[in-house]
């Protein structure tokens, strides 16, 4: 059978202006898995998103990361797209210092 | 989900050109980027640009200074403002969802003629 | 702009026939790639979406595939239905452009 994968989101300060948001899927089955970042919906262009390779997390489940570097201010237009066995969830950037926003898809 | 253009098929040269889009079957401001794009005679088509379901938008560079995409939310609709318009503006004005990396809803379209 | 090139801009097919159309970017467009048909009535449809995923309704005799700059739209036994203008769009750099067309006709 699947198992869904866990998604949580993190931001960190990039550069002046600049904050860098990833969104990591884990413990999942099988490795087949869409993650891609998007602004307003729409998916942003592969140039300016880069990817995780899809490894073994060591309990027969995969993992894997995809970032993007964003204005500061504009957190609420962006949101972390997740497609995995059939099922779709998406994921907003955390509000500054806020702790890790974990999400268990079903 | 469907969407459905409506306005004026005559515009007069200079004047403005105003359409709206009305949305059934889901929220402008659920998820999404609500856009609109225009098919020339000859069938070229060209995407103006776009209103997101947070209320920001994006245009098309070769027409920022022209176009303004607003919406109402309480109608579940959108708008096209394209300003200073001339005959090269003259063209079927479609509306469109545009979801992740596609635009998977398409209204009819409305045919618009730019002419003194 | 991205420059989508469409070819052939028409062609005329018997039905069950086997037919492709193909479009080329001017750059990596990096699978973002997507295939509408506009009936003659002027109402548009997605068909294919991300190269190669089908969109929920749509016939599986539609198919996609290609990379880097070079894509093609395939459907594996022409029906009458089929008669219609595709349309390629990349939409991996903004502004999203479009191809000019292939019109498909019944011989």
């Known amino acids: 059978g699947s198992v869904p994968p866990m998604v949580n989101v993190t931001r960190s300060e990039a550069s002046e202006g600049n904050i860098t948001v990833t969104c990591r899927a884990s413990s999942f089955y099988p490795r087949n898995i869409t993650l891609t970042w998007r602004q307003d919906g729409v998916s942003l262009s592969h140039d300016t998103q880069q990817w995780g390779d899809v490894l073994p997390d060591g309990n027969g489940t995969y993992q894997t990361w995809v970032a993007t570097r964003i204005c500061q201010g504009e957190e609420q237009r962006f949101t972390c797209y997740m497609e995995h066995s059939g099922n779709h969830s998406t994921h907003p950037v955390p509000s500054g210092n806020s702790h890790h926003h974990h999400h268990h898809h079903h | 989900v469907q969407l459905q253009e409506s306005g004026p098929g005559l515009v007069k040269p200079s004047q403005s050109l105003s359409l709206t889009c009305n949305v059934t079957?889901?929220?402008?401001?659920?998820?999404?980027?609500w856009n609109w794009i225009r098919q020339f005679p000859g069938n070229k088509l060209e995407w103006i640009g776009y209103?997101?379901?947070?209320?920001?938008?994006t245009y098309n560079p070769s027409l920022k200074s022209r176009v303004s995409i607003t919406r109402d939310t309480s109608k579940n609709q959108f708008f096209l403002q394209l300003n200073s318009v001339t005959p090269e503006d003259t063209a079927t004005y479609y509306c469109?969802?545009?979801?992740?990396?596609?635009?998977?809803?398409w209204g009819l379209g409305t045919s618009v003629t730019v002419s003194s | 702009d991205i420059q989508m090139t469409q070819t052939p801009s028409s062609l005329s097919a018997s039905l069950g026939d086997r037919v492709t159309i193909s479009c080329r970017a001017n750059?990596?467009?990096?699978?973002?790639l997507n295939w509408y048909q506009q009936k003659p009535d002027g109402a548009v449809k997605l068909l294919i979406y991300?190269?190669?995923r089908i969109h929920s309704g749509v016939p599986s005799r539609f198919s996609g595939s290609g990379s880097g700059t070079d894509y093609s739209l395939t459907i594996a036994n022409l029906e009458q239905e089929d008669v219609a203008t595709y349309f390629c769009q990349q939409g991996n750099t903004p502004p999203t452009t479009f191809g000019g067309g292939t019109k498909v006709e019944i011989k």
């Open positions: 991300y190269t190669s």
């Open positions: 209103i997101g379901y947070t209320g920001s938008t």
């Open positions: 750059q990596d467009i990096s699978h973002y």
């Open positions: 079957g889901y929220s402008i401001t659920g998820d999404y980027a």
């Open positions: 469109a969802r545009w979801r992740n990396w596609a635009m998977d809803y």
